[in-house]
Protein backbone atom coordinates (compact mmCIF):
# COMPACT_ATOMS: atom_id res chain seq x y z
CA UNK A 1 0.00 0.00 0.00
CA UNK A 2 1.40 3.37 -0.99
CA UNK A 3 1.47 6.40 1.28
CA UNK A 4 -0.86 9.26 0.42
CA UNK A 5 0.88 12.16 -1.31
CA UNK A 6 -0.16 15.55 0.04
CA UNK A 7 0.96 19.03 -0.91
CA UNK A 8 1.76 22.15 1.05
CA UNK A 9 0.39 24.94 -1.13
CA UNK A 10 1.81 28.43 -0.83
CA UNK A 11 1.24 31.55 -2.88
CA UNK A 12 3.77 34.20 -3.75
CA UNK A 13 3.89 37.45 -5.68
CA UNK A 14 6.91 37.45 -8.00
CA UNK A 15 7.96 40.60 -9.81
CA UNK A 16 10.15 39.99 -12.84
CA UNK A 17 11.90 42.43 -15.12
CA UNK A 18 11.89 41.27 -18.72
CA UNK A 19 15.46 40.49 -19.76
CA UNK A 20 17.16 40.57 -23.18
CA UNK A 21 15.68 37.14 -23.95
CA UNK A 22 12.32 37.92 -22.32
CA UNK A 23 10.89 36.36 -19.16
CA UNK A 24 12.74 33.09 -19.70
CA UNK A 25 10.18 30.39 -19.08
CA UNK A 26 7.71 28.13 -20.90
CA UNK A 27 4.12 27.34 -19.98
CA UNK A 28 1.63 24.53 -20.48
CA UNK A 29 -2.10 24.42 -19.81
CA UNK A 30 -5.26 26.22 -20.75
CA UNK A 31 -8.82 25.18 -21.49
CA UNK A 32 -7.74 23.59 -24.77
CA UNK A 33 -4.54 21.99 -23.41
CA UNK A 34 -5.21 20.51 -19.98
CA UNK A 35 -1.81 19.38 -18.77
CA UNK A 36 -3.01 18.53 -15.28
CA UNK A 37 -6.17 16.40 -15.21
CA UNK A 38 -9.31 18.35 -14.31
CA UNK A 39 -7.33 21.60 -14.19
CA UNK A 40 -7.15 24.06 -17.06
CA UNK A 41 -4.70 26.27 -15.17
CA UNK A 42 -1.40 27.58 -16.52
CA UNK A 43 1.77 25.86 -15.29
CA UNK A 44 5.49 26.56 -15.66
CA UNK A 45 6.98 23.74 -17.74
CA UNK A 46 10.54 24.98 -18.23
CA UNK A 47 12.80 27.71 -16.91
CA UNK A 48 15.43 28.93 -19.33
CA UNK A 49 18.98 28.94 -18.03
CA UNK A 50 20.22 32.48 -17.36
CA UNK A 51 16.83 33.95 -18.24
CA UNK A 52 15.01 36.51 -16.10
CA UNK A 53 13.06 33.90 -14.12
CA UNK A 54 16.13 31.73 -13.49
CA UNK A 55 18.20 34.69 -12.32
CA UNK A 56 15.42 35.77 -9.95
CA UNK A 57 15.31 32.22 -8.59
CA UNK A 58 11.81 32.08 -7.11
CA UNK A 59 9.76 30.69 -9.99
CA UNK A 60 10.00 26.89 -10.25
CA UNK A 61 9.02 24.32 -12.85
CA UNK A 62 5.62 22.96 -11.84
CA UNK A 63 4.43 26.24 -10.34
CA UNK A 64 0.89 27.30 -11.24
CA UNK A 65 0.56 30.90 -12.41
CA UNK A 66 -2.66 32.40 -11.11
CA UNK A 67 -2.41 35.90 -12.57
CA UNK A 68 -0.22 38.20 -14.66
CA UNK A 69 -0.19 41.89 -13.76
CA UNK A 70 -3.41 41.30 -11.82
CA UNK A 71 -5.18 39.57 -14.71
CA UNK A 72 -6.62 36.18 -13.78
CA UNK A 73 -5.48 33.21 -15.88
CA UNK A 74 -8.60 31.11 -15.26
CA UNK A 75 -10.46 29.71 -18.28
CA UNK A 76 -8.01 30.94 -20.89
CA UNK A 77 -7.09 29.25 -24.15
CA UNK A 78 -3.43 28.26 -24.20
CA UNK A 79 -2.47 30.75 -26.92
CA UNK A 80 -4.32 33.55 -25.15
CA UNK A 81 -2.25 32.85 -22.04
CA UNK A 82 0.95 32.86 -24.11
CA UNK A 83 -0.02 36.19 -25.69
CA UNK A 84 -0.77 37.63 -22.27
CA UNK A 85 2.79 36.91 -21.13
CA UNK A 86 4.32 38.14 -24.37
CA UNK A 87 2.43 41.43 -24.14
CA UNK A 88 2.81 41.92 -20.39
CA UNK A 89 5.37 44.71 -20.66
CA UNK A 90 8.78 45.27 -19.11
CA UNK A 91 7.85 44.83 -15.44
CA UNK A 92 5.75 41.73 -14.91
CA UNK A 93 3.98 40.77 -11.70
CA UNK A 94 3.12 37.09 -11.32
CA UNK A 95 0.86 35.58 -8.67
CA UNK A 96 2.21 32.06 -8.30
CA UNK A 97 1.14 28.92 -6.47
CA UNK A 98 3.98 26.69 -5.29
CA UNK A 99 3.25 23.08 -4.33
CA UNK A 100 5.69 21.38 -1.97
CA UNK A 101 5.10 17.65 -1.90
CA UNK A 102 4.96 15.88 1.47
CA UNK A 103 4.11 12.24 1.96
CA UNK A 104 2.01 10.67 4.70
CA UNK A 105 1.34 6.99 5.27
CA UNK A 106 3.37 3.80 5.70
CA UNK A 107 7.12 4.24 6.14
CA UNK A 108 9.31 3.28 3.24
CA UNK A 109 6.62 3.15 0.59
CA UNK A 110 6.37 5.51 -2.31
CA UNK A 111 3.89 5.64 -5.16
CA UNK A 112 5.47 4.45 -8.38
CA UNK A 113 6.41 7.40 -10.51
CA UNK A 114 5.90 9.86 -7.66
CA UNK A 115 8.77 12.25 -7.05
CA UNK A 116 10.39 11.45 -3.73
CA UNK A 117 8.37 13.54 -1.27
CA UNK A 118 9.73 14.06 2.24
CA UNK A 119 7.58 12.12 4.73
CA UNK A 120 6.32 14.65 7.24
CA UNK A 121 7.37 12.54 10.23
CA UNK A 122 10.98 12.82 9.05
CA UNK A 123 10.71 16.56 9.57
CA UNK A 124 8.61 16.59 12.72
CA UNK A 125 10.48 13.91 14.73
CA UNK A 126 13.93 15.61 14.61
CA UNK A 127 12.34 19.01 15.31
CA UNK A 128 10.50 17.58 18.34
CA UNK A 129 13.66 15.84 19.58
CA UNK A 130 15.71 19.03 19.24
CA UNK A 131 13.05 20.99 21.11
CA UNK A 132 13.08 18.48 23.97
CA UNK A 133 16.89 18.53 24.21
CA UNK A 134 16.92 22.33 24.19
CA UNK A 135 14.25 22.47 26.92
CA UNK A 136 16.16 19.96 29.07
CA UNK A 137 19.43 21.89 28.65
CA UNK A 138 17.67 25.14 29.52
CA UNK A 139 16.19 23.65 32.70
CA UNK A 140 19.60 22.27 33.76
CA UNK A 141 21.18 25.65 33.12
CA UNK A 142 18.55 27.42 35.26
CA UNK A 143 19.06 24.95 38.11
CA UNK A 144 22.78 25.75 38.17
CA UNK A 145 22.16 29.48 38.53
Amino acid sequence: MNGRVDYLVTEEEINLTRGPSGLGFNIVGGTDQQYVSNDSGIYVSRIKENGAAALDGRLQEGDKILSVNGQDLKNLLHQDAVDLFRNAGYAVSLRVQHRLQVQNGPIGHRGEGDPSGIPIFMVLVPVFALTMVAAWAFMRYRQQL
Epitope: G24, V28, Q33, V44, S45, E49, H78
Partner: nanobody
Protein backbone atom coordinates in the same frame (compact mmCIF):
# COMPACT_ATOMS: atom_id res chain seq x y z
CA UNK B 1 10.62 12.76 -21.91
CA UNK B 2 10.31 12.56 -25.67
CA UNK B 3 12.47 10.65 -28.16
CA UNK B 4 12.88 12.02 -31.70
CA UNK B 5 13.79 10.20 -34.92
CA UNK B 6 14.30 12.10 -38.19
CA UNK B 7 13.96 10.69 -41.67
CA UNK B 8 13.66 11.89 -45.27
CA UNK B 9 17.13 13.27 -45.85
CA UNK B 10 19.16 12.51 -48.94
CA UNK B 11 20.90 13.85 -52.03
CA UNK B 12 18.95 16.24 -54.22
CA UNK B 13 19.77 18.59 -57.08
CA UNK B 14 19.59 22.36 -56.68
CA UNK B 15 16.03 23.56 -57.17
CA UNK B 16 14.63 20.23 -55.97
CA UNK B 17 12.50 19.37 -52.96
CA UNK B 18 12.68 17.13 -49.89
CA UNK B 19 10.30 16.44 -47.05
CA UNK B 20 11.81 15.67 -43.67
CA UNK B 21 9.82 13.88 -40.97
CA UNK B 22 10.40 13.69 -37.24
CA UNK B 23 8.59 10.96 -35.32
CA UNK B 24 8.24 11.55 -31.60
CA UNK B 25 7.59 8.98 -28.91
CA UNK B 26 6.64 9.85 -25.36
CA UNK B 27 3.66 11.36 -23.61
CA UNK B 28 1.82 14.61 -24.28
CA UNK B 29 3.32 15.36 -27.71
CA UNK B 30 0.70 18.07 -28.16
CA UNK B 31 2.23 20.12 -25.33
CA UNK B 32 5.63 20.35 -27.04
CA UNK B 33 6.94 23.20 -29.15
CA UNK B 34 8.84 21.60 -32.04
CA UNK B 35 11.66 22.95 -34.15
CA UNK B 36 14.14 22.16 -36.88
CA UNK B 37 17.79 23.16 -36.76
CA UNK B 38 20.66 22.47 -39.15
CA UNK B 39 24.40 22.18 -38.82
CA UNK B 40 26.87 22.44 -41.68
CA UNK B 41 30.40 21.05 -41.20
CA UNK B 42 32.47 23.26 -38.90
CA UNK B 43 29.58 25.58 -38.12
CA UNK B 44 27.19 26.02 -35.20
CA UNK B 45 23.74 24.49 -35.11
CA UNK B 46 21.38 27.05 -36.62
CA UNK B 47 17.66 27.60 -36.22
CA UNK B 48 15.55 26.76 -39.27
CA UNK B 49 11.88 26.70 -38.21
CA UNK B 50 9.59 26.34 -35.20
CA UNK B 51 5.97 25.32 -34.73
CA UNK B 52 3.70 25.80 -31.73
CA UNK B 53 1.96 22.95 -29.90
CA UNK B 54 -1.22 23.23 -32.01
CA UNK B 55 0.42 24.17 -35.28
CA UNK B 56 -1.29 27.55 -35.15
CA UNK B 57 1.94 29.52 -34.96
CA UNK B 58 5.16 29.10 -36.94
CA UNK B 59 8.47 30.91 -37.27
CA UNK B 60 11.31 30.68 -39.79
CA UNK B 61 14.90 31.77 -40.24
CA UNK B 62 15.20 34.50 -42.88
CA UNK B 63 17.32 32.24 -45.07
CA UNK B 64 14.47 29.72 -45.56
CA UNK B 65 11.36 31.94 -45.51
CA UNK B 66 9.13 31.27 -48.50
CA UNK B 67 10.96 28.04 -49.35
CA UNK B 68 10.52 25.84 -46.25
CA UNK B 69 7.28 24.97 -44.46
CA UNK B 70 7.02 23.40 -41.02
CA UNK B 71 3.89 21.47 -40.03
CA UNK B 72 2.80 18.87 -37.52
CA UNK B 73 0.29 16.08 -37.07
CA UNK B 74 -0.45 15.61 -33.37
CA UNK B 75 -2.48 12.47 -34.06
CA UNK B 76 0.64 10.88 -35.57
CA UNK B 77 3.14 12.48 -33.15
CA UNK B 78 5.06 13.76 -36.16
CA UNK B 79 6.49 17.07 -37.32
CA UNK B 80 7.46 17.78 -40.94
CA UNK B 81 9.74 20.13 -42.82
CA UNK B 82 8.86 20.61 -46.47
CA UNK B 83 11.90 22.04 -48.25
CA UNK B 84 11.46 23.50 -51.75
CA UNK B 85 13.78 25.38 -54.10
CA UNK B 86 16.78 23.84 -52.36
CA UNK B 87 20.18 25.50 -52.71
CA UNK B 88 23.71 24.15 -52.16
CA UNK B 89 23.86 26.38 -49.06
CA UNK B 90 21.08 24.25 -47.52
CA UNK B 91 23.47 21.29 -47.30
CA UNK B 92 23.70 20.26 -43.65
CA UNK B 93 22.65 17.73 -41.06
CA UNK B 94 19.06 18.59 -40.08
CA UNK B 95 17.97 18.05 -36.48
CA UNK B 96 14.51 17.86 -35.01
CA UNK B 97 14.15 19.44 -31.56
CA UNK B 98 11.48 19.60 -28.88
CA UNK B 99 10.79 21.54 -25.70
CA UNK B 100 7.83 21.17 -23.38
CA UNK B 101 5.44 24.08 -23.29
CA UNK B 102 5.28 27.36 -25.15
CA UNK B 103 7.91 30.06 -24.69
CA UNK B 104 6.50 33.17 -23.04
CA UNK B 105 9.01 35.20 -25.04
CA UNK B 106 8.18 36.20 -28.58
CA UNK B 107 11.09 35.62 -30.92
CA UNK B 108 11.63 35.11 -34.63
CA UNK B 109 14.85 33.33 -33.79
CA UNK B 110 15.46 30.49 -31.38
CA UNK B 111 18.80 29.23 -30.15
CA UNK B 112 19.60 25.59 -29.48
CA UNK B 113 19.48 26.50 -25.76
CA UNK B 114 15.71 26.95 -26.10
CA UNK B 115 15.27 23.21 -26.73
CA UNK B 116 15.84 20.19 -24.51
CA UNK B 117 15.32 17.13 -26.72
CA UNK B 118 17.11 16.33 -29.96
CA UNK B 119 17.04 13.71 -32.69
CA UNK B 120 20.17 12.12 -34.13
CA UNK B 121 19.93 14.17 -37.35
CA UNK B 122 19.43 13.42 -41.03
CA UNK B 123 21.84 14.47 -43.79
CA UNK B 124 20.62 16.73 -46.59
CA UNK B 125 23.00 17.28 -49.51
CA UNK B 126 22.15 19.70 -52.32
CA UNK B 127 24.39 19.41 -55.38
Amino acid sequence: DVQLVESGGGLVQAGGSLRLSCAASGRAFNTYTMGWFRQAPGLERDFVAEISWSGGSTGYADSVKGRFTISRDNAKNTVYLQMNSLKPQDTAVYYCAAVIGSPTDYSDYRSSLDYDYWGQGTQVTVS
